[in-house]
Interface confidence: low
Amino acid sequence: AITEAREEAKPYPLFPGPFPGSLQTDHTPLLSLPHASGYQPALMFSPTQPGRPHTGNVAIPQVTSVESKPLPPLAFKHTVGHIILSEHKGVKFNCSISVPNIYQDTTISWWKDGKELLGAHHAITQFYPDDEVTAIIASFSITSVQRSDNGSYICKMKINNEEIVSDPIYIEVQGLPHFTKQPESMNVTRNTAFNLTCQAVGPPEPVNIFWVQNSSRVNEQPEKSPSVLTVPGLTEMAVFSCEAHNDKGLTVSKGVQINIKAIPSPPTEVSIRNSTAHSILISWVPGFDGYSPFRNCSIQVKEADPLSNGSVMIFNTSALPHLYQIKQLQALANYSIGVSCMNEIGWSAVSPWILASTTEGAPSVAPLNVTVFLNESSDNVDIRWMKPPTKQQDGELVGYRISHVWQSAGISKELLEEVGQNGSRARISVQVHNATCTVRIAAVTRGGVGPFSDPVKIFIPAHGWVDYAPSSTPAPGNADPVLII
């Protein structure tokens, strides 16, 4: 890379007197201090008198004694105004100024684009004292320039509260094009137009863009950055990138994949999480979404019984949370279950079908022909019934539940009794005389308690009073309140 000065690069004399303009001398500076903080104050200990500063970039020192003459204006010497170089190269530039020895506490600082450069920049200030003036050279070096080093650099010197500013030195770091906007991966509908954008900057400018699709150039003629490529539509996945060219060479963007939206893959791993008599909770793992978000899913349920009519029940649900409770199913039945999900393009195929079963249900019919009669001699109520016509899906009968409610003079007491499945009769102790006893019976399976029969009432006449506690404990002398006949 060439460091190029846009101005004529004559060596300017840095200062008058014994110092040659090129500084290629064997003069050793009296004081050479590296900048720890970006600038180094020049400390001068010669006798001084304050001068009257002028405003602006030039200070004209004045001496107060009668015999003294005004000193020449203070200003930074001209130097190269524009340095062009390639990225990662080194550069060194400087400011120089001659300061009368009457001044002390002079400080030089470096500024870039209006901000003071502090910290880790490599700046050195050198002092070359003479009888009347001290030449100060502030040099700034960058070992490996980057784009961020582009900008306008100036020196500032404070002298007796006056600020002297150098002419700017423009550093232009040139390199390969740098992308500020690269194409983005997209999921698009088949045969639908879409746009890709690519933008790159120098220096050097201009930057020209070529588009590449699947390793082949799309445009024969380059477009000036920024460039928007309108793709009329794709039928299959493609990879796009853009090439950015300038005088330094070529940079290629990342390749981005443009996917074609398609119907999703079928869900996998449909599994049964829980079964009850009338519902099944399923979960599934969604398949590949076809580059388009899932919208919802359809659960298809058909009876696995070969004698069924083959109708399919369909339940629609949102795509998340991959969980659905299928309701309104028959008890103790076998079902085939499949899941299909959709995106904006369409429905997936149905998942592999899985077999699931509901558990036993509670009986659907109450016991029949319930009769109740009073056995006064033993102070018992006898109950008879007929076994209900149970359906297969109601499960196996495990027993009966008897509810008997005793009502008398504002008192009401309900007792529940459980009896085994083999009986069709039961005997309960009279709880209250001069009262009405209301009896209802329900069949019980492992699936639960079925409906109660219609109530049957019997009046228990006054025949002494049987006391009772508010629990279901039987009256004295009746250790077992229910007897299976």
């Epitope: 919802n296 949102s318 959709m342 904006e344 393009i345 429905w347």
Partner: antibody, heavy 120, light 108 residues
Framework: QVQLVQSGAEVKKPGASVKVSCKAS????????INWVRQAPGQGLEWMGW????????KYNEKFKGRVTMTTDTSTSTAYMELRSLRSDDTAVYYC?????????????WGQGTTVTVSS | EIVLTQSPDFQSVTPKEKVTITCSAS???????FHWYQQKPDQSPKLLIY???NLASGVPSRFSGSGSGTDYTLTINSLEAEDAATYYC?????????FGQGTKLEIK
Amino acid sequence: QVQLVQSGAEVKKPGASVKVSCKASGYTFTTYDINWVRQAPGQGLEWMGWIYPRDGYTKYNEKFKGRVTMTTDTSTSTAYMELRSLRSDDTAVYYCARGYYDNLYYFDYWGQGTTVTVSS
Amino acid sequence: EIVLTQSPDFQSVTPKEKVTITCSASSIISSNYFHWYQQKPDQSPKLLIYRTSNLASGVPSRFSGSGSGTDYTLTINSLEAEDAATYYCQQGRSVPLTFGQGTKLEIK
């Protein structure tokens, strides 16, 4: 039973907008799409787009993009279709229809239709 | 977009006759995505057949549907006076959802 009841007929001037409503009942409103289909006098059926009430997801026919907006109010189970910048060729009967996802995509229930006349 | 072309546009038939309406698609459509509607004068369209051959609820058994690929057919066996209507095919395979131009059936 499932019912879709639409708002009454409208007469509009060119350049104006119209907003048609469709009140659903008899099913869970958020479970099915509401589609809008129009039929110009003596012409066939033309699908305008759908909205999924659960999340407000819309899909419009490209022909109407930029002019049509479909919205829903789930608290009242009502869908709305607004068509802007009306022209005389927008004169049509506008139907709402429930979209059924048993393999995309058919319309199992229809509203009674709303006649929109665009005339200066 | 998928274009559906119905044939014929218009047909005048006598009661008890058998009627066949065809619908041709511009690209192949799975039978799951193909449906038929009936629209009587001054009424909304009504779903007639879904997924090529399934009768919608309440549709008489004299209606039937068949087809695959790009060609689909609606058949009415033993036409009745109440079948005077315009019949539309529809595809649900891709957006925009599209209908055929319609076939008007007149009873002589």
